[in-house]
């Protein structure tokens, strides 16, 4: 970068290099060549020269002074007009940066997703920082006290193997940078209770000839938790609303579940699992699209049909069995 | 060699306006900044606008009495500066350089042209 | 802004004089300093740039000196084509600012 430029004096920024963006700064050029005594001096930023707000401090040294600055990132160097010289003569140069201090990250979760062997953990990190912004994941054990410490830019993976203090944890986040420091709040997990179980997948759909013609869903997980709940949700493509229906799922054998719907409409199916009475998800799958005939013939749609879609994570709190909508939306 | 040559000076009413064009020529337009100097009748020279040279990025510079009034511009293609005059008032008469400034100071001038704002 | 006076208003002379015009800026200006020469219904011209440093084609009885916040044009011997009106400029900080004029009439 513009900081290892062989210097002919020094660069250096009022209130910090990295400071709070928004504020006001000033960068000080202080030139030191050799039978130079500077006509002028010089700033560029991002290679553009700077034409306002330079002053004079000295016969060696100049201020460039910038209000409200709100850039990420400049590079910054400075020159030197010498008399007798044609070409200005560089000075130094310096990156500076411009950001925020960490929020105080939030909604932090842990999971396990089925055959990972690893717990994720996740949270809220607020606000862009727009500066290098390092978290620390503490993880301690609530049976024997050991603390292990994990540094990241975003999310952890904690391999499960390495969590040897039982199945009871502590987990906060810390957040720091240059401006900065935060710490979460504490989040108490049972190894137990955080598994998410594997995939569920929806593989086909056919609709069936009838006096009121069906259409079965065929989906299945390699889960092999046993009380498993699933949603599925589905909606006609031109619809905003989705209708969700609840099931007490054994994976044992591959699901069949079986919809009546409008004719000649193209349908979206999703399907979201979790370890019954637990507190975690699975994200819904990916979208699954079937079209229904128009009368009588057999339609049957395959898993190779998914088109890209935004799978969000909708809650629905319905009783098994029943159609609902639900009408939050994604 | 450089040349320099203004036009669109004239007669105006207050709180009308005026274009002035300065055409350039005989040096790379782009590489030097451009001015506008005023001078009113009698009186001394001011800078009234600038803008400046590529390595600058064109950064424009307006003194205080002509800020919201007056636009400068520059047409690389063309070769030529232009200084937009509106809500002209009777203290906006003078003659009106066209000025090429390399480092700051200036080293050449147009010939100038006259604005009267009067009615 | 940097504010710069110039002293005397007005001077006469005859030809042959040595002629001083005087500048002074409300700040040090580093040698940043021109002066301009300018007759009646003309644009001013360009003498000397960087407080002491002969513009080409300019004649060598002009000569310009000084440093910090004082500087001086000269001429060595006024000659009849020089009567006409001088203007300092700094162009030590953006934006540049000119002197009132010394203008140098017949005596």
């Known amino acids: 970068g513009i900081t290892n430029i062989n210097c002919s004096g020094h660069i250096w920024v009022e209130p910090a290099t990295i400071f709070k963006m928004g504020m006001n700064i000033s960068i000080y050029c202080q030139a030191a060549i050799k039978n130079c005594q500077p006509r002028k001096l010089h700033f560029y930023k991002n290679g553009i020269k700077e034409r306002f707000q330079i002053t004079r401090i000295n016969k060696t040294t100049a201020r460039l002074w910038y209000k409200n600055f709100l850039e990420p990132h400049a590079s910054m160097y400075c020159t030197a007009e010498c008399p007798k010289h044609f070409q200005e003569t560089l000075i130094c140069g310096k990156d500076i940066s411009s950001g925020y201090p960490p929020d105080i990250p939030d909604e932090v979760t842990c999971v396990i997703y089925e055959y990972s062997g690893n717990m994720t953990c996740t949270w809220n990190a607020g606000k862009l920082t727009y500066i290098d912004t390092k978290y620390v994941v503490h993880v301690k054990s609530l049976e024997t006290e050991e603390e292990q410490q994990y540094l990241t830019s975003s999310y952890i993976n904690i391999s499960t193997d390495s969590l040897q203090g039982g199945k009871k944890y502590l987990v906060w986040v810390q957040a720091a940078n240059a401006l900065g420091m935060e710490e979460s709040k504490q989040l108490q997990i049972h190894l137990d209770d955080i598994v998410i179980p594997s995939a569920a997948v929806i593989s086909r759909a056919e609709t069936i000839n009838a006096t009121v013609p069906k259409t079965i869903i065929y989906w299945d997980s390699q889960t092999t938790i046993e009380k498993v709940s699933c949603e599925m949700r589905y909606k006609a493509t031109t619809n905003q609303t989705w209708n969700v229906k609840e099931f007490d799922t054994n994976f044992t054998y591959v699901q069949q579940s079986e919809f009546y719907l409008e004719p000649n409409i193209k349908y979206v199916f999703q399907v979201r699992c979790q370890e019954t009475g637990k507190r975690y998800w699975q994200p819904w799958s990916s979208p699954f699209f079937h079209k229904t005939p128009e009368t009588v013939p057999q339609v049957t749609s395959k898993a190779f049909q998914h088109d890209t879609w935004n799978s969000g994570l909708t809650v629905a709190s319905i009783s098994t069995g029943h159609l609902t909508s639900d009408n939050r939306g994604d | 060699q450089v040349q320099l040559v203004e036009s669109g000076g004239g007669v105006v009413q207050p709180g009308r306006s005026l274009r002035l064009s300065c055409a350039a020529s005989?040096?790379?337009?782009?590489?030097?900044?451009m001015s506008w100097v005023r001078q009113a009748p009698g009186k001394g020279l001011d800078l009234v606008a600038d803008i400046n040279s590529k390595s600058y990025d064109y950064a424009t510079y307006y003194a205080d009495s002509v800020k919201d009034r007056f636009t400068i511009s520059r047409d690389n293609s063309k070769n030529t500066l232009y200084l937009q005059m509106n809500s002209l008032r009777a203290e906006d008469t003078a003659v009106y350089y066209c000025?090429?400034?390399?480092?700051?100071?200036?080293?050449?001038w147009g010939q100038g042209t006259l604005v009267t704002v009067s009615s | 802004d940097i504010q710069m006076t110039q002293s005397p208003s007005s001077l006469s002379a005859s030809v042959g004089d040595r002629v001083t015009i005087t500048c002074r800026a409300s700040q040090d200006i580093y040698t940043n300093l021109a002066w301009y020469q300018q007759k009646p219904g003309k644009a001013p011209k360009l003498l000397i740039y960087?407080?002491?440093s002969l513009q080409d084609g300019v004649p060598s009885r002009f000569s310009g000196s000084g440093s910090g916040t004082d500087y001086t044009l000269t001429i060595s011997s006024l000659q009849p084509e020089d009567f006409a009106t001088y203007y300092c400029l700094q162009d030590s900080e953006y934006p540049p600012t000119f002197g009132q004029g010394t203008k140098v009439e017949i005596k």
């Open positions: 000025a090429v400034h390399h480092s700051d100071y200036f080293e050449y």
């Open positions: 005989g040096f790379d337009f782009n590489s030097y900044g």
């Open positions: 960087h407080a002491s």
